[in-house]
Interface confidence: low
């Protein structure tokens, strides 16, 4: 299953399959997740080691048993791949690293006014993988405000150095934020020229394209079909690049298919997994296990659940079957692709779905309609779980926020439905940033069921929580995916990086905002909060957040939206915007429903009819 915990001051011994330099443990974890054989990783921050060569070292590891011995190493951080972790799987990495220079091939330099602009330039350059920016206080005047766009053979820095007044980061192309745009066309009977960066076997051009999209240096590809004239090249997928970023030439060639990486697509990227099953095809590879199962779909599920399994073949040969069950061959290889693909067999083959965003495990297991004051504009995909709950009566208007917690589930505040419990008047917009972008043609979700907490009472602040079941499940994208729920009764975690988002009023007597607003707000202890609200009981099922001096807060229209906190590189839904005395007033923190206290209720209500929970909190 999905294991998200990080081990501090621990290093996994042995099992190495690859190593690289990464700026932090989270990026190292992401590289592990996308590496076909990596199950575990260990990262050495600069502070943890004197050996300059090993500083920022990211060590990717595999283990037959799924675990390795841990040794104590001060400062080291270790953890698990996020394979099988559903929507948490993403190649998108937005962080900016201050005081760090990520080295690579510098292929472009320009003067810019901010690190954000530098990151944007990298994101809009087809070859840029990461960048470094020298700030205005950099010690050498001639380098100040320089934005260096970089790449490397593996897509990660060739070295990372601690350097004052330098800021580094990665391209946001994997966040589907590139302005370049992409070519969706597949070109039949056409072969591209240029440099081959890798060669893998795939059953079709679509798998080849997805592998190209997630390969650090692939910009385009050519696939040789299973009827290609040279037998040894059949089903070969050649991943390619060029100096210009586009093929320098193409040749008409029977039984070849070519196309482009989809990494530069805006607003949508393909999932990093392959769900199709190929009848009459055998995938060869190293045998992991053989098991008797009923049907090819169960075979694929079995492969997906066995974390080391990369692909499978389900045999229908009479000697491989007994009664209704047949042999399911679970396999793996060095590069995650079959070592042999055979056609015209009595088997069916396919891939593990461990890197799919959309599995069952897709969620990590006010007194007045309140309230973002003192916030700033959000950017695309920054808060992909945020939804807008709108009511369509004569006119249509935004009333509340909400958080996507599963394909078919939104969590919000119960008081949003005070006086409006009719499900057919509500429209739920997900994957949006600007309310003004909503037109009559914008797709929205309708409500199948509103589940208000049984102990909620109108005009009281207690149990201000409600679940919305959508009529149809949503697909996950970089702009529309769920937020992890906390563990039940999560009281030990100290959250220091918390944000509230919403389209609510920007001042107490204001109006709904067009662009989704965000504000960084510290949590306040319940004892401190209680002192500020003598009239109301601040229960253990509430959490408060705000600045003593006020000035930043949620406000009218933000109700039901998320209070999220980042811990160990993972965002969690800590609170639901509920109520407060006015907005952003001095010594009047916002009060939020504490989600951890309602985990039993959430899991009970979201149980599917077959008794399997549709969401789970992180391990």
């Amino acid at each position: 299953g999905c294991l998200t915990q990080l081990y501090e001051n621990a290093f996994f011994r042995g099992g190495d399959v690859a190593s690289m330099y990464t700026p932090n443990a989270q990026y190292c974890q992401m590289r592990c997740t996308f590496h076909p054989r990596c199950l575990l990783f260990s990262f050495l921050p600069a502070s943890s080691i004197n050996d300059m060569e090993k500083r920022f070292g990211c060590f990717l590891k595999d283990s037959v048993t799924g675990t390795l011995p841990k040794v104590h190493r001060t400062g080291a951080v270790s953890g698990h791949s996020l394979k099988q972790c559903g929507h948490q799987i993403s190649a998108c990495h937005r962080d900016i690293y201050k005081g760090v220079d990520m080295r690579g091939v510098n292929f472009n330099v320009s003067k810019v006014s901010s690190v954000e602009e530098c990151q944007k330039r990298c994101t809009s350059n087809i070859r840029c993988q990461f960048f470094s920016y020298a700030t205005q206080t950099f010690h050498k005047a001639e380098y100040r405000n320089n934005c260096l766009l970089k790449y490397s053979p593996g897509g990660t820095p060739t070295a990372i150095k601690v350097l004052s007044n330098v800021e580094s980061g990665f391209s946001l192309k994997p966040c589907a934020l590139s302005e370049i745009g992409c070519h969706m066309n597949i070109f039949q009977h056409l072969a591209f020229s240029d440099v081959d960066v890798a060669r893998v076997l795939t059953p079709d051009a679509f798998v080849c394209r997805t592998i190209c999209t997630y390969h650090p240096n692939c910009l385009f590809f050519t696939f040789y079909t299973n009827v290609w004239k040279i037998e040894s090249q059949r089903n070969v997928c050649l991943l390619k690049t060029s100096e210009s970023g586009t093929p320098s030439s193409s040749t008409p060639q029977e039984n070849t298919i070519s196309g482009y990486s989809l990494l530069t697509c805006k607003r949508t990227l393909p999932e990093p997994c392959h769900s199709k099953i190929y009848p009459g095809v055998d995938f060869g590879g190293e045998e992991l296990n053989v098991t008797f199962v009923k049907g090819v779909n169960v075979c694929q599920e079995t492969c997906t659940k066995m974390i080391r399994c990369q692909f499978f073949t389900y045999s229908l040969l009479p000697e491989d079957c007994k009664e209704e069950k047949c042999k399911c061959f679970l396999r793996l290889s060095m590069d995650g692709s079959p070592t042999r693909i055979a056609y015209g067999t009595q088997g069916s083959s396919g891939y593990s779905l461990r890197l799919c965003n959309t599995g069952d495990n897709s969620v990590c297991t006010t007194k007045t309609s309140t309230r973002i004051v003192g916030g700033t504009n959000s950017s695309w995909g920054e808060w992909p779980w945020q939804v807008s709950l709108q009511v369509k009566l004569t006119a249509q208007r935004h009333l509340c926020g909400g958080s996507l917690i599963g394909h078919q589930w939104v969590l919000t505040a119960a008081h949003c439905f005070d006086g409006l419990p009719l499900q057919d008047v509500w429209r739920i917009y997900s994957g949006i940033l600007n309310l003004s972008d909503i037109t009559k043609d914008t797709p929205f979700s309708q409500i199948k069921e509103i589940i208000i907490h049984q102990n909620y009472k109108v005009s009281e602040g207690n149990h201000d929580i409600a679940l919305i079941k959508l009529q149809a499940p949503l697909n996950y994208t970089e702009f529309q995916k769920p937020i992890c729920l906390p563990s039940k009764g999560d009281t030990s975690t100290i959250y220091t990086n918390c944000w509230v988002t919403g389209w609510g009023f920007s001042k107490e007597k204001g109006e709904i905002q067009n662009i989704l607003q965000k504000v960084n707000i510290p949590l306040v202890t319940n004892e401190e909060c209680q002192k500020r609200y003598q009239d109301y009981k601040i229960t253990q099922r509430m959490v408060c957040a705000g600045y003593k001096e006020g000035g930043k807060d949620a406000c009218k229209g933000d109700s039901g939206g998320p209070l999220v906190c980042k811990h160990n590189g993972m965002w969690r839904l800590v609170g639901i915007t509920s109520w407060g005395e006015g907005c952003a007033r001095r010594e009047q923190p916002g009060v939020y429903t504490k989600v951890a206290e309602y985990m039993d209720w959430i899991l009970e209500k979201t149980q599917s009819s077959d008794g399997k929970a549709q969401m789970q909190s992180p391990a």
């Epitope: 009472k457 149990h463 009239d535 009981k537 253990q540 099922r541 206290e597």
Partner: antibody, heavy 118, light 107 residues
Framework: EVQLLESGGGLVQPGGSLRLSCAAS????????MGWVRQAPGKGLEWVSR????????IYADSVKGRFTISRDNSKNTLYLQMNSLRAEDTAVYYC???????????WGQGTTVTVSS | DIQMTQSPSSLSASVGDRVTITCRAS??????LNWYQQKPGKAPKLLIY???SLQSGVPSKFSGSGSGTDYTLTISSLQPEDFATYYC?????????FGQGTKVEIK
């Protein structure tokens, strides 16, 4: 000395009305939520109603909802309970209490008796 | 509404005895539980708040414990002035509710 003193109890016929008062002294009345609790003869305690310190939020037990109204006058340091449509089952000793979320009902009055009988 | 069930309804004890009264809530009340003492003809008096915190001025022979749904009031050494009726009360969610009371009598 922190003190609460109820008044206004008495005998009333079913369907009648009564207004109870509770005078507070010895503490900053306007800073505390207040509540009413009653006790029928030979029975246990029953929570009746609560009002926030400013008077902006009121809560009632289902048994009295729509018939009783809690209010306060912070300038007079006084809490009130207006009781309408009284029934025999409303017969009880009515206590007013300071209702601090943090420490419960920490200050009580001596009680005033309400008898509803024909 | 949350139901509060006290047990026993009454008990007979001697001076010096250790007495325990339990209170069970129909759902978790997260330690939002208070204990009161009431003597005949008098107003109730707060003894314990938040399940285990001793109210100012209350002797330390009274103690409270518990979490979730189950709570206990203990009188370590019963004295003549402790013979009274004891009530638990939840303030987890409105309406506040009291237990039916436990009458502690002289054996």
């Amino acid at each position: 000395e922190v003190q609460l003193l109820e008044s206004g109890g008495g005998l009333v016929q079913p369907g009648g009305s009564l207004r109870l008062s509770c005078a507070a002294s010895g503490f900053t009345f306007s800073s505390y939520p207040m509540g009413w609790v009653r006790q029928a003869p030979g029975k246990g305690l029953e929570w009746v109603s609560r009002i926030s310190s400013s008077g902006g939020m009121t809560i009632y037990a289902d048994s009295v909802k729509g018939r009783f109204t809690i209010s306060r006058d912070n300038s007079k340091n006084t809490l009130y309970l207006q009781m309408n449509s009284l029934r025999a089952e409303d017969t009880a000793v009515y206590y007013c209490a300071r209702d601090d979320w943090n420490v419960g009902m920490d200050v009580w009055g001596q009680g005033t008796t309400v008898t509803v009988s024909s | 509404d949350i139901q509060m069930t006290q047990s026993p309804s009454s008990l007979s004890a001697s001076v010096g005895d250790r007495v325990t009264i339990t209170c069970r809530a129909s759902q978790s009340i997260s330690s939002y539980l208070n204990w009161y003492q009431q003597k005949p003809g008098k107003a109730p008096k707060l003894l314990i708040y938040a399940a285990s915190s001793l109210q100012s001025g209350v002797p330390s022979k009274f103690s409270g414990s518990g979490s979730g749904t189950d709570y206990t009031l203990t009188i370590s050494s019963l004295q003549p002035e402790d013979f009274a009726t004891y009530y638990c009360q939840q303030t987890y969610t409105t309406p506040w509710t009291f237990g039916q009371g436990t009458k502690v009598e002289i054996k």
